[in-house]
């Protein structure tokens, strides 16, 4: 079982390989000096049907380096960064993992593209392995709350409350959504 020639790349090179390309072979892409690699640099020859070989993902692309490009902080609710830090320049990558009791959908890594957007795929999502969710928490008088997403919230996520200036927060500042679908505490109040 073998794979066909790896997909070509403009303004870059493909690592050495011999033919036939055996299942298990890895080929790696790199870009010329003034270009930046967007996407996974390593492709793996696999077989899905034990008959034909295929590459496990699309080839990355080489974008002409844009020194003015910068990307915003990428947010994945229920997830956290395991690699990458601000500022995010053209060609920089960020890799995510999901919090406990969350599973990932999509690709764990994204790259800062010349158009100031993360790509070449969408940001991954972290989905709660528990079907239960906590109901949306109310806003509080003279205060605010921040949550990682709107509406009902998956277990493992939290909401942080704060009070307007001149008001004191009474109760729990951070309330966690438990795996039972219940909140760890009642909302606090803001008192003068």
């Amino acid at each position: 079982i073998s794979c066909g020639s790896p997909p070509p790349i403009l303004n870059g090179r493909i690592s050495y390989y011999s033919t036939p390309i055996a299942v298990g072979t890895v080929i790696r892409y790199s870009c010329s000096g003034t270009f930046r690699l967007i996407g996974e640099k390593s492709l793996l020859c696999i077989t899905k049907d034990k008959v034909d070989g295929t590459w496990d993902k699309p080839a990355p692309k080489c974008e002409y380096f844009n020194k003015y490009s910068s990307c915003p902080e990428p947010i994945v609710p229920g997830g956290y960064k395991i690699r990458g830090s601000t500022p995010y320049r053209h060609g920089d990558s960020v890799t995510f993992a999901c919090k406990t009791n969350f599973s990932m959908n999509g690709n764990k890594s994204v790259w800062c593209q010349a158009n100031n957007m993360w790509g070449p795929t969408r940001l991954p999502t972290c989905v709660s392995v528990f079907p239960l969710e906590c109901p949306a928490l109310p806003m509080i008088h003279n205060g605010h709350h921040t949550s990682e997403n709107v509406g009902s919230i998956a277990p493992g996520l939290s909401v942080t409350y704060s009070c307007e200036s001149g008001y004191l927060l009474v109760g729990e500042k951070i309330i966690n959504c438990l795996s039972s679908g219940k909140w760890s505490a009642v909302p606090p109040t803001c008192e003068e």
């Epitope: 690592s15 050495y16 011999s18 299942v23 890895v26 790696r28 390593s42």
Partner: antibody
Amino acid sequence: QVQLVQSGAEVKKPGSSVKVSCKASGGTFSSYAISWVRQAPGQGLEWMGRIIPILGIANYAQKFQGRVTITADKSTSTAYMELSSLRSEDTAVYYCAREEDISGYYQDWGQGTLVTVSS
Amino acid sequence: DIVMTQSPATLSVSPGERATLSCRAGQSISSYLAWYQQKPGQAPRLLIYDASSRATGIPARFSGSGSGTEFTLTISSLQSEDFAVYYCQQYEYWYSFGQGTKLEIK
């Protein structure tokens, strides 16, 4: 950090086989490749082959083709390396080493297993 | 197979000084090169990957450079714990290691 724990030292007769295990803990066994690298006494490092457990795909260095078999048991997060038709020059420390995804370099290594081939 | 050649075989340097280790590939390997440190009785430890990226927890005194066929590992100010054997490894086409450079105290 992933920890790789290998089986203990072995003494074997020429012509026999040896099977060394490497148990991984921490991380996701399915998200990495395990290579086997050996080091003869006072010598350098020599790559023997590697397996991608999630796919069950194993590839071997030409020198060891037909004599080495690398397998993995996903249920126990354990990789195995079996070397057959042993000869005295196979006396070495055998290491398992982990590469994240298919990065090509080894972030974590087992402690090594000394295999002595002697009549 | 891609043959990796390290030089010198042995390097004698005084603590506090700079050490420069070389690795040459038999054909272009782009930047697909890693450096490892090995002390007696221990497994190798990853220092540098992709020719110049420091692995997690590796001190800043270790740096890597080069691309194509010529690569260098530099240790800017040698500490006592740095005296060991250093190996380069390519991953352009499968995997192969250099024969090692022994860094010893002068």
